[in-house]
């Protein structure tokens, strides 16, 4: 299987833009948006911190913990109204990811 | 590291529920996939389904009327239920940790695996 | 659902030789293609994932490779231990489909 150039294998992602607003103390505010060739079933994610194609049920449900978005050994946990989730560290640090 | 370990009763009776309990150790069953495996005598791998985090599940079509995966986080614990078993449910029944590598997901961690006889 | 489809289902070989394994999907998934290994009354343990990357702990005579429908995993210079039951399986769909086993044993 040959892929032309900027044609990405499926099931994979690769980010397209990512912005960063630093502006205010303490906290970050990154946008990305990424490119995913999914399989059949599955939709554009966050796995383990990284984009990937992910079961779109996921995606339907707002489960968004059950991407894994987070590091090995982060805990994540939905935010109100499932618009989006946090990953926590084991220091106790807050990673706050809302979907748009 | 992590380990699993099966357990559940060796025995059980035709048109019964077969019910096994997979115990993760040494690491959180939030953070990863679970997935039952099955191996009939002498025969290969069939996967069985994997649950999420949520509880939300996929199932093997072949199974999917029969079968049940739950999770009990405050234990670290998930569980099968197969309901209606026949002889050929007979097995060895494996839990497994799935793991995301990237965009790839592998059954990186294995239980021991416990024998299942269907029989009266 | 996707057929996974091993060859030869069965393989004799020598200690230090080198042999291949070849493992056919029905569609094409990809990379998205694991081998592991089993011993008798053994649980399967991972050898490689995405078609070609070793799985930590692994020796590096074993490797893979493959794309899309047409995959191999190789094995230079077999050890003792190597003799054993081979499985791919896809993780592109559900459900996930092993292939049937390849089983080397010393000739």
């Known amino acids: 299987q040959f892929l032309k150039e900027g044609q990405l294998a499926a099931g994979t992602c690769e980010i397209v833009t990512l912005d960063r607003d630093s502006s205010q103390p303490r906290r970050t505010i990154a946008r990305q948006t990424v490119k995913c060739s999914c399989f059949p079933g599955q939709i554009a994610g966050t796995t383990r911190a990284r984009p990937a194609c992910v079961d779109a049920r996921i995606i339907k449900t707002k489960q968004w913990c059950d991407m894994l978005p987070c590091l090995e050994g982060e805990g994540c946990d939905l935010l109100i109204n499932r618009s989006g989730w946090t990953c926590t560290q084991p220091g106790g640090r807050i990673k706050t990811t809302t979907v748009s | 590291q992590v380990q699993l370990q099966e357990s559940g009763p060796g025995l059980v009776k035709p048109s019964e529920t077969l019910s096994l309990t997979c115990t993760v150790s040494?690491?959180?069953?939030?953070?990863?996939?679970w997935s039952w495996i099955r191996q009939p005598p002498g025969k290969g791998l069939e996967w069985i389904g994997y649950?999420?985090?949520?509880?939300?599940?996929n199932y093997n079509p072949s199974l999917k009327s029969r079968v049940t995966i739950s999770v009990d986080t405050s234990k670290n614990q998930f569980s099968l239920n197969l309901k209606s078993v026949t002889a050929v449910d007979t097995a060895v029944y494996y839990c497994?940790?799935?793991?995301?590598?990237?965009?790839?997901?592998?059954?990186?961690?294995w239980g021991q695996g416990t024998t299942v006889t269907v029989s009266s | 659902d996707i057929q996974m489809t091993q060859s030869p289902s069965s393989l004799s070989a020598s200690v230090g030789d080198r042999i291949t394994i070849s493992c056919r999907a029905s569609?094409?998934?990809?990379?998205?293609l694991n081998w592991y290994q089993q011993t008798p009354g053994k649980a399967p343990r991972l050898l490689i994932y995405?078609?070609?990357t070793l799985q930590s702990g692994v020796p590096s005579r074993f490797s893979g490779g493959g794309s899309g429908t047409d995959f191999s995993l190789t094995i230079t210079s077999l050890q003792p231990e190597d003799f054993a039951t081979y499985y791919c399986?896809?993780?592109?769909?559900?459900?996930?489909?092993f292939g049937q086993g390849t089983k080397l044993d010393i000739k």
């Open positions: 497994a940790r799935v793991n995301p590598f990237g965009y790839y997901y592998a059954m990186d961690v």
């Open positions: 040494g690491g959180s069953i939030s953070s990863y996939y």
């Open positions: 649950i999420y985090p949520s509880g939300s599940t």
């Open positions: 569609q094409s998934i990809s990379t998205s």
């Open positions: 995405g078609a070609s």
């Open positions: 399986q896809e993780s592109a769909s559900i459900p996930r489909t």
